[in-house]
């Protein structure tokens, strides 16, 4: 739920202040170059003007900012503290603005952020402590309610020498900062694990959204503590089985729905469980729509109409019957 | 339209039972916990009960035991069971949706009252 | 039994003045920001102003403003317009192992000096 506008009047700034530099301090309520304001709304639109580096002048009204489709490549400390601060800053929308680097204390200075999304950006370099603003092992708590971080994993020679997945949990988990956060999206990043701790340390979540990433289990992944997650989103992953000890987590969570279309299910005697589950729970979404992937003889076939005798396992032979 | 709309009010006799419907429009109550909140002439507003995403429910202490919230997701309906009425519970019934982020009423009806009364 | 406790709960006010209306909680909100206020004309359905403690509602007009955290809140319009003059209400949202719980303020009506 990106931030919008509805309110009309939006003005822009006249084309020769583009280049203008300024020594004064800007007037309180000034539209920045290149983008469109509107005090009614409260919002800031600087969309697809190859920006690099975010206004300086940003008027202090503003509580929705736009600053999509740019070419920022690198978010400073403080990128956003100004004087007086932006304090009605609420949603902020960096999307698609190339930024491969997130520094440390990036958002610090927005006491209202509660709403950001860094989607579409190639992420080679997210700092520990870019939503955290501290290295202290428990920093001030960050305002951020929902955190959108979807298709944010660069590509694979970008990548520095250390796993993308534990360098974007390293930033969640900074500190306990965000302890309040209660949307979290994590699609499109190529993620083939999740690391068993990060969970447990975002209590407050009630929307998570994993899908089309590479997940081939959650078998260390606990959801025991997530008493208010109401939707997982798993779909688009290579999940093969889930087994006893997630399906009771996810059986015991009052108010989850979980999405599971699209994943390579394989329908061998491990999957009796997760059948016998779907049969009875109410959890899973569209739970008539799963279907076998492998073996081959089971391709296609739907979870929920299989039964204990079409779930085999291969016997594993002896080493002195094994045929090279 | 997003929208919410109350209907089955009306004049019954203490010790008598109304059943209101709510019927949501331009979203999926799949995905929406929903609420009963009530109002006496003149007085204030008073939460009643809600109804989370997949069904959880929760009420008021008066309200345990004389009214029973429940939903039809593929119908969009919300319903409130009121059985035992007494003439206290005479008010405009509202029927709100909860945001799916934070826990405040963003989404209200036009209310549909209910008289108790022999 | 939680209880939500308005103050005023009426008040008389000018076109231009600046209101505060406080609210305050036997017990904390859910996250210590789960505090929302609503505006209510007569015959109409409440409105959503502030969200969240401090949050303002789309569309609502900045010269509202909560602020508040854990137990007591504060609703502050800084210049009152004609169309401000209404019922004001508090919501807290709280969560215990029983699960969730609702409740208003019993109101604070403004009206016009």
């Known amino acids: 739920s990106s931030p919008t506008s509805s309110a009309s009047s939006f003005s822009s700034s006249a084309p020769f202040l583009a280049s203008a530099v300024s020594a004064q301090p800007p007037l309180p309520d000034q539209c920045p170059a290149l983008c469109e304001c509107s005090e009614a709304a409260r919002t800031v639109k600087c969309v697809n003007r190859n920006l690099t580096e975010v206004p300086t002048d940003l008027p202090a009204y503003v509580r929705n900012l736009f600053l999509t489709g740019n070419q920022l490549a690198v978010l400073p400390a403080g990128a956003f503290a100004r004087r007086p601060p932006l304090a009605e800053l609420a949603a902020l929308n960096l999307s698609g603005s190339r930024l491969d680097e997130v520094r440390a204390g990036a958002f610090e200075h927005l006491p209202s952020l509660r709403q950001l999304d860094l989607s579409h950006n190639p992420l080679a370099d997210l700092s520990p402590f870019a939503f955290s603003g501290s290295n202290a092992s428990v920093s001030a708590p960050s305002p951020l309610v929902e955190l959108i971080l979807n298709h944010i994993v660069p590509p694979e020679d970008e990548r520095q020498n250390r796993s993308f997945e534990g360098m974007v949990v390293a930033a969640l988990l900074a500190g306990r900062a965000l302890q309040g956060l209660r949307r979290l999206e994590l699609a499109s990043n190529h993620f083939l694990y999740l690391p068993r701790d990060v969970l447990a340390q975002l209590p407050s979540l009630r929307h998570l959204d994993l899908s089309n990433n590479s997940l081939v289990s959650l078998t260390y992944v606990s959801f025991r503590n997530l008493t208010h997650l109401e939707s997982l989103h798993l779909e688009d992953n290579a999940l093969k089985v889930l087994h006893n000890g997630t399906l009771a987590e996810l059986q015991g969570l009052p108010h989850i729905r979980v999405f599971l279309d699209n994943n390579p299910w394989v329908c061998d005697c491990h999957m009796a469980d997760m059948v016998t589950w779907l049969k009875e729970t109410e959890v899973v979404q569209g739970k008539d729509r799963l279907t076998c992937a492998y073996p081959e003889k089971m391709r296609n076939r739907v979870l929920l109409e299989l039964n204990s005798a079409d779930l085999d396992c291969d016997p594993i032979l002896p080493p002195s019957l094994q045929t090279s | 339209e997003v929208k919410v709309e109350e209907s089955g009010g009306g004049l019954v006799q203490p010790g008598g039972s109304l059943r209101l419907s709510c019927a949501a429009s331009?979203?999926?109550?799949?995905?929406?916990?929903m609420s009963w909140v009530r109002q006496a002439c003149g007085k204030g507003l008073e939460w009643v009960s809600i109804i989370a995403g997949r069904g959880s429910t929760y009420y008021a202490s008066w309200a345990k035991g004389r009214f029973t919230i429940s939903k039809d997701n593929s119908e969009g309906m919300v319903y409130l069971q009121m059985n035992s009425l007494r003439a206290e519970d005479t008010a405009v019934y509202y029927c709100?949706?909860?945001?799916?982020?934070?826990?405040?009423?963003?989404?209200w009806g036009q209310g549909t009252t209910v008289t108790v009364s022999s | 039994e939680i209880v939500l406790t308005q103050s005023p709960s009426s008040l008389s006010a000018s076109v231009g003045d600046r209101v505060t209306i406080t609210c305050q909680s036997s017990?904390?909100?859910?996250?210590?920001?789960?505090l929302s206020w609503y505006q209510q004309k007569p015959g109409k359905a409440p409105k959503l102003l502030i969200y969240?403690?401090?949050t303002l509602a789309s569309g609502v007009p900045s010269r509202f403003s909560g602020s508040g955290s854990g137990t007591d809140f504060t609703l502050t319009i800084s210049s009152l317009q004609p169309e401000d003059f209404a019922t004001y209400y508090c919501q807290g949202s709280y969560y215990s192992g029983s699960g969730w719980y609702y409740a208003f303020g019993q109101g604070t009506k403004l009206e016009i000096k």
């Open positions: 331009g979203f999926s109550l799949s995905s929406y916990w």
């Open positions: 969240y403690a401090s």
């Open positions: 017990q904390s909100v859910y996250s210590n920001n789960e």
């Open positions: 709100a949706r909860v945001s799916s982020i934070y826990y405040t009423f963003n989404l």
